[in-house]
């Protein structure tokens, strides 16, 4: 299911394109870089280490592990001064759905 | 100037070398006499966007940190029995 971030109250928020999107379905977790980079080449870091071969806005982990894959994620581009950071901790399961 | 996320027992804490500024999301509780924001229990899935407090001159050195927890407390396993 889609788990987009939502503001929890009416405090002035930053624009939606500056947020990461996190989508979780079964054991797959997809993190989408904020839409501030336009058509620039994107790089990803996980816990300050470059993620080799990741150059798209989406970073996908098919078998996400709460222990190994939770942590700090950052995406950045040559034309943007700031890195965008996400601290993600997710518990996943193969055959389950989340109910509210 | 980067927000750090720490877990102590079952709670989530954000800290900075200054103080933590909440942009949106989980309110949290500022711990007295400290530079730490308590976001509460991790099983409650705290989520939000935060950054370190900085002067105007230094604000461009304080990046945003989005926090996203999904601890699957309300997850239901689908098996033949559940689907029946």
């Amino acid at each position: 299911q889609d788990e987009d971030f939502k503001a929890s109250d009416d405090l002035t928020s930053i624009s939606p394109e500056k947020r990461f999107k996190v989508s979780i379905s079964g054991t797959e977790v997809v993190v989408t870089c904020p839409d501030v980079f336009g058509y620039d080449n994107i790089k990803w870091e996980k816990n300050d280490n470059l993620v080799e071969g990741a150059s798209n806005r989406e970073l996908s982990q098919k078998e996400f592990s709460e222990v190994d894959d939770s942590g700090y994620y950052a995406c950045y581009a040559d034309s943007i001064k700031e890195k965008s950071y996400l601290y993600l901790r997710a518990r996943v399961c193969a055959n389950c759905i989340e109910v509210n | 100037f980067k927000v750090s996320v720490e877990e102590l027992e079952d709670r989530v804490f954000l800290s900075c070398n200054t103080s933590v500024l909440r942009i949106e999301g989980t309110m949290g509780i500022q711990l007295p006499h400290s530079r730490t924001l308590d976001l509460g229990k991790r099983i409650l899935d705290p989520r939000g966007i935060y950054r370190c407090n900085a002067t105007e001159e230094q604000s461009d050195k304080a990046p945003y940190m989005q926090v996203y927890y999904r601890m699957c407390q309300n997850c239901v396993e689908l098996n033949s029995a559940t689907l029946a």
Partner: antibody, heavy 116, light 107 residues
């Protein structure tokens, strides 16, 4: 030494088409996003279109969406701008630029005139 | 959409220092480029990423950026520096340009 050489500009009638080319040298072409910027006579500068290093992501300004297409051939170190359904307001000098948002080098430009 | 504000014109006496400003909300959080356009010529990037000079650009050109203002400084302006100067930032994929500042070098 970085070089960007644009070509393909011409006088064309409204609703006509043109294809601009920009040949790059002096840097690893596929490592860089590329951009097309235009300047109408006596006017300011405007980003027209951009494309990332492997060609998978593109950007267009609203005024040209659906009419212009940016593409690249990394084997030929060339970026293209296919311009269809041209209008009088597309008349401008078109510049090729290295980079996306922080371009550090522009070409000399090629002139596109749309007139009946 | 993001907006950049530049003074329409700046005058400087020959060999004196000129400052051209570019204002934008929290512009210090973005990279700024400065583009020089001599009348009748193609634009040339003279500063990129706030303060970097491309190869061949004289040292008298320098850039700074913090808070809500970016500044291009020309130390010891020469007659050949008479031109239009545009500031530019990347914002959500698009490029945003200032309206341009016409620099006049007074002899």
């Amino acid at each position: 030494e970085v070089q960007l050489v644009e070509s393909g500009g011409d006088l064309v009638k409204p609703a006509g088409s043109l294809r601009l080319s920009c040949v790059a040298s002096g840097f690893t072409f596929s490592d860089y996003s590329m951009s097309w910027v235009r300047q109408a006579p006596e006017k300011g500068l405007q980003l027209v279109a951009g494309i990332n290093g492997d060609g998978s992501t593109t950007y267009y300004t609203d005024a040209v969406k659906g009419r212009f297409t940016i593409s690249r051939d990394n084997a030929k170190n060339t970026v293209y701008l296919q311009m269809n359904s041209l209008r009088a307001e597309d008349t401008a000098m078109y510049y090729c630029a290295k980079g996306a948002g922080t371009g550090d080098f522009w070409g000399q430009g090629t002139l596109v005139t749309v007139s009946s | 959409s993001y907006e950049l504000t530049q003074p329409p014109s700046v005058n400087v006496t020959l060999r004196e220092t000129a400052h051209i400003t570019c204002g934008g909300a929290s512009i210090g959080r973005k990279y700024v480029q400065w583009i020089q356009q001599i009348p009748g010529q193609a634009p040339v990037v003279i500063i990129y990423k706030d303060s970097n000079r491309p190869t061949g650009i004289p040292e008298r050109f320098s850039g700074a950026n913090s808070g809500n203002t970016a500044t291009l400084t020309i130390s010891g302006a020469l007659a050949e520096d008479e031109a239009d100067y545009y500031c530019q930032v990347g914002d959500s994929g698009a490029w945003v340009f200032g309206e341009g500042t016409q620099l006049t070098v007074l002899r």
